[in-house]
Interface confidence: low
């Protein structure tokens, strides 16, 4: 995967929150849930109230990237999804407020959001070949593809 220094000269400026309180379901219709204080996991839920609700914030790149760059926050908290390395769980990082500017190693907080029909992909800005993914009996992690599941459906207005 690409080292952090690969994009260290690019600056990302926060624009606005573009989605509030949405749920992410993977291709097996498993919802992302909180596993503990640090990690997320996926489970098939009867009651979507147990699913994590996310907010999505958009960032603008200093190099005028065509891709939509986003940060993912657990709604009503100060917890942000943070990438580690390949096959490592994504972390929930606590920050007092949404970062106004992100650069260098902090790009592990950012993801490129791509949509193909109803499928949504979140590629790590710090590791551009890796996606947010679910894996059987494991945490939500960063992965390059199968057997991990990298495509998600966004469910909105679940209130």
């Amino acid at each position: 995967s690409a080292p952090f220094s690969f994009l260290s000269n690019v600056k990302y400026n926060f624009m606005r929150i573009i989605k509030y309180e949405f749920i992410l379901n993977d291709a097996l219709n498993q919802s992302i849930i909180r596993a503990n204080d640090q990690y997320l996991t996926a489970a098939a839920l009867h009651n979507l109230d147990e699913a994590v609700k996310f907010d999505m914030g958009a960032y603008k790149s200093s190099k005028d990237d065509a891709k939509i760059t986003v940060i993912l926050r657990i709604s009503k908290t100060q917890l942000y999804v943070t990438a580690q390395d390949e096959d490592q769980p994504v972390l929930l990082k606590e920050m007092p407020e949404i970062p106004k500017t992100i650069t260098g190693s902090e790009t592990n907080l950012l993801f490129f959001w791509e949509t193909h029909g109803t499928k949504n992909y979140f590629t790590s800005v710090a590791h551009p070949n890796l996606f947010i993914a679910t894996k059987q009996d494991y945490w939500v992690c960063l992965a390059g593809g199968p057997p991990s599941i990298t495509d998600f459906q966004i469910l909105e207005n679940q209130a």
């Epitope: 909180r34 596993a35 503990n36 204080d37 640090q38 109230d49 147990e50 709604s75 009503k76 606590e94």
Partner: antibody, heavy 122, light 107 residues
Framework: QVQLVESGGGVVQPGRSLRLSCTAS????????VHWVRQAPGKGLEWVAA????????YYAESVKGRFTISRDNSKNILFLQMDSLRLEDTAVYYC???????????????WGQGTLVTFSS | DIQMTQSPSSVSASVGDRVTITCRAS??????LAWYQQKPGKAPKLLIY???NLETGVPSRFSGSGSGSDFTLTISSLQPEDFATYYC?????????FGGGTKVEHR
């Protein structure tokens, strides 16, 4: 089954220190955020402090900030509350509590200990 | 910090009565609210989480409703073992806070 057992309470003089412990069993302690909640005699519940699963994030009520320190030893399944500069208004039963699984620190508290009493000598 | 205000502070009721307790948050907390029952000399017991979800093993006569800043705990038909003090707690902020409590006592 989940068990939380507090210890370390007792009679203390104002201005002195006391260290409470809470020993956990029946679950993977290192996976959960844990809390201290207190209850003064005849009064309601007051949340005191919380610590994240790995001890890296700590949160305190305004009434104890700067005087109390929450910590944990995951290798021994123990939660601590170091109470310094104790005041008469700190008289209370102190409970440790654990959240439901799958939730972060701001959690409903599904499992509680029996409590340990901290009182003051006149 | 988020302040939680419960009312009434006490209520007199008889077995079979329907009892309603309200809780108001000083700011919007979505559905991040829990209800507890406490009996004298005992630790609190979680009844309801996220405003309306019944904790495992809690009788269905207990129910919770509300979102935003106004919430309600209802006991549909009070049983002898339900005489106790009830507390609400917000779980929206990292700094948790409880309501002042409502004592349900014999009429």
């Amino acid at each position: 089954q989940v068990q939380l057992v507090e210890s370390g309470g007792g009679v203390v003089q104002p201005g002195r220190s006391l260290r409470l412990s809470c020993t956990a069993s029946g679950f993977t302690f290192s996976m959960f955020g844990v809390h201290w909640v207190r209850q003064a005699p005849g009064k309601g519940l007051e949340w005191v402090a919380a610590v994240s699963y790995d001890g890296s994030n700590k949160y305190y009520a305004e009434s104890v900030k700067g005087r109390f320190t929450i910590s944990r030893d995951n290798s021994k399944n123990i939660l601590f509350l170091q109470m310094d500069s104790l005041r008469l208004e700190d008289t209370a039963v102190y409970y440790c509590a654990r959240g439901r699984p799958k939730v972060v620190i701001p959690a409903p508290l599904a499992h509680w200990g029996q409590g340990t009493l901290v009182t003051f000598s006149s | 910090d988020i302040q939680m205000t419960q009312s009434p502070s006490s209520v007199s009721a008889s077995v079979g009565d329907r009892v309603t307790i309200t809780c108001r948050a000083s700011q919007g907390i979505s559905s991040w609210l829990a209800w507890y029952q406490q009996k004298p000399g005992k630790a609190p017991k979680l009844l309801i989480y996220e405003a309306s979800n019944l904790e495992t093993g809690v009788p269905s006569r207990f129910s919770g409703s509300g979102s935003g800043s106004d919430f309600t705990l209802t006991i549909s038909s009070l049983q002898p073992e339900d005489f106790a003090t009830y507390y609400c707690q917000q779980t929206s902020s990292f700094l948790l806070s409880f309501g002042g409590g409502t004592k349900v006592e014999h009429r």
